[in-house]
Interface confidence: low
């Protein structure tokens, strides 16, 4: 059974009413929430989905964070640094360093590391362990879904009776944060990428830091930026023919923030698309390239383009645009083949420009075949 | 924006079931819990226990053990509150409250409240 | 008979201050962390008001404060409004159990 009224109860007689906010905070304090957060990582296991666990679990990062406590006391696990909890914390602070995470983490003397998700036509995902998927993933699908952020896409089908989608939806919410931001929420749909939140702010709010969260429209109606200082994330959202694409670059440490792994850990950006949801479209690629557009229809996940949008046009043109034969060329050739749709190209270009400003590293923009999943991976 | 809304008004007679729904809407239903609270007319609040969305766990008060099942379906963001063999001090307006999430259990936004009149 | 005592009424003119004690034991106050107050005008939902003893939900005014000492918990009320006039409850989650004090009203006059 799960005990966490137990750690709640050694806790509270630990602390003796200490916890209640103080000016001068004690070592035996931080001493007594390390023992608390060893007991709830005891019996974590017995306590999924438990309100009081997970309270707990949300009030000791909160007082750690709060009493400048360090988590790497005898009875923790060491970690980088203290991410606050994503809980409503109303206090104000003069000064919200708490609200831009680049400063607070250099703080502790290291250099957080970013990973880069993307979303883009018939849809191809990049993951943010940099693997590369082509889905179908129909309807809605978690793309993100960590204690501070949440992105739903909707993926409709390109063409009547096929099993090619392309996102037309993009739900994104903030949530409540601290002194910096209150919840927000960005939706964009085909034709309509708003510069604001849905409640037609441009910020987090009212709260102190409530700039740590910023929308710049960058090209009206075509591209748009939102920056989440606070988490140190930047997501840039575009509309591109008929068709949505996401983008974001995330710090590790936010991307793992997940509470319940069985349920939130299973979003897009982090696991991939279930197998079954997985179109193999290298195979496609190889099997154009000999066959040419006129028989490929037997073998398409999808129906094929008009034949007048011959394999040559379609290689010229993502040439064109992509130079370099990575996955994103492969992924404009499919999208050209499967659609016949002209802007899927420049989907794929965008794509890519967008892993050129968020990717942290360099050498990872393109990806190349050999980084293709093995059947029997998510 | 966030809210919870609740069934209409019942009328049960003693020895009946009520079960009374609350929709949720604004919000991730599943990242917070949901407790029910009942206030007779002229008396205070009296909590009579908390559901985990997510997981389905429950926790009842002690004195209603046994007659209240409280439940939740994910796919439409609603909760309900079944109260079986009914008597009439169970005559009240019952409330839905979302449990606000990360270390402080709290009752951030309430339902609109559903009267339940039990008479013979 | 509610687990947390909290007192019938308290009054107070427009501008004054006014505090609501709530008491409880070692157990349901004085060791928890947990202690939310709400506001309840007649005929509507509860609103929260304070959590957490003493932290404010955005919108709520800061005339409002909470503190907590022992096993009593206070809410005050400075520069007393007309539509503070309402019934205010203390609630303490404490190990299974969510308790509610009584219900305090308080008048305007």
């Known amino acids: 059974p799960c005990k966490i009224l137990k750690c709640n109860s050694e806790f509270w007689s630990a602390t003796s009413g200490s916890h209640a906010p103080a000016s001068d905070d004690t070592p035996e304090f931080c001493a007594a929430l390390r023992s608390y957060a060893l007991c709830t990582r005891r019996t974590a296991r017995t306590c999924r989905g438990d309100l009081a666990y997970h309270s707990a679990v949300h009030g000791i990062e909160d007082l750690m964070s709060q009493h400048n406590c360090s988590k790497d006391g005898p009875t923790s696990q060491p970690r980088l640094r203290t991410l606050p909890p994503a809980g409503d914390s109303q206090e104000r602070s003069d000064s919200p360093e708490i609200c831009h995470y680049e400063k607070s983490f250099h703080k502790h003397s290291a250099t957080p590391n970013y990973t880069h998700c993307g979303l883009f036509g018939d849809p191809h995902l990049r993951t943010f362990t940099d693997r590369f998927q082509t889905c179908k993933v129909q309807g809605a699908w978690p793309l993100i879904d960590n204690n501070y952020l949440n992105v739903q896409v909707t993926n409709t089908p390109v063409l009547p009776g096929s099993a090619a989608t392309a996102t037309s939806k993009l739900t994104i919410i903030f949530k409540n944060f601290q002194e910096c931001v209150d919840q927000k929420v960005y939706q964009a749909e085909m034709d309509e990428l708003p510069a604001a939140f849905v409640d037609g702010s441009k910020n987090g709010g009212d709260k102190h830091g409530a700039n740590s969260l910023k929308i710049t429209e960058k090209v009206s109606g075509q591209h748009v930026e939102i920056q989440a200082k606070y988490i140190g994330t930047t997501i840039v959202v575009r509309q591109v023919g008929r068709y949505l694409t996401f983008a974001v670059r995330m710090p590790e440490e936010v991307v793992n923030a997940v509470e319940d792994w069985d349920s939130q850990g299973l979003y897009l950006c982090l696991r991939g698309c279930p197998l079954n949801q997985q179109i193999d479209f290298q195979a496609f690629h190889t099997n154009a390239e000999g066959t040419g557009a006129r028989r490929l229809a037997a073998a398409s996940p999808a129906p094929t383009a008009p034949e007048t949008f011959p394999y040559e046009t379609a290689v010229a043109k993502c040439k064109e645009k992509l130079p370099v034969e990575d996955l994103y060329y492969q992924a404009c050739v499919f999208d050209l083949l499967t659609t016949g749709d002209v802007n899927f190209t420049l989907a794929a270009y965008y794509a890519l420009e967008d892993v050129k400003m968020l990717h942290s590293n360099k050498d990872k923009l393109h990806l190349y075949e050999r980084t293709r999943d093995l059947p029997g991976r998510a | 924006e966030v809210q919870l809304v609740q069934s209409g008004a019942e009328v049960k007679k003693p020895g009946a079931s009520v079960k009374v729904s609350c929709k949720a809407s604004g919000y991730t239903f599943t990242s917070h819990g949901i407790s029910w609270v009942r206030q007779a007319p002229g008396q205070g609040l009296d909590w009579m226990g908390w559901?985990?969305?997510?997981?389905?766990?429950?926790n009842y008060a002690q004195k209603l053990q046994g007659r209240v099942t409280m439940t939740t379906d994910t796919s439409t963001s609603t909760a309900y509150m079944e109260l079986s063999s009914l008597r009439s001090e169970d005559t009240a307006v019952y409330y839905c409250a979302r449990v606000g999430s990360g270390p402080y259990y709290y009752m951030d936004v309430w339902g609109q409240g559903t009267l339940v009149t039990v008479s013979s | 008979q509610s687990a947390l005592t909290q007192p019938r009424s308290v009054s107070g003119s427009p501008g004054q201050s006014v505090t609501i004690s709530c008491t409880g034991t070692?157990?349901?106050?004085?060791?928890?962390?947990?202690v939310s107050w709400y506001q309840q005008h007649p005929g509507k939902a509860p609103k929260l008001m304070l959590y957490d003893v003493t932290k404010r939900p955005s919108g709520v005014p800061d005339r409002f404060s909470g503190s907590k000492s022992g096993n009593t918990a206070s809410l005050t009320i400075s520069g007393l409004q007309a539509e503070d006039e309402a019934d205010y409850y203390c609630?303490?989650?404490?190990?299974?159990?969510?308790?509610f004090g009584g219900g305090t009203k308080v008048t305007v006059l």
């Open positions: 070692s157990s349901s106050v004085g060791d928890s962390i947990y």
């Open positions: 559901i985990s969305p997510y997981s389905g766990n429950t």
């Open positions: 609630v303490s989650y404490a190990g299974t159990d969510t308790l």
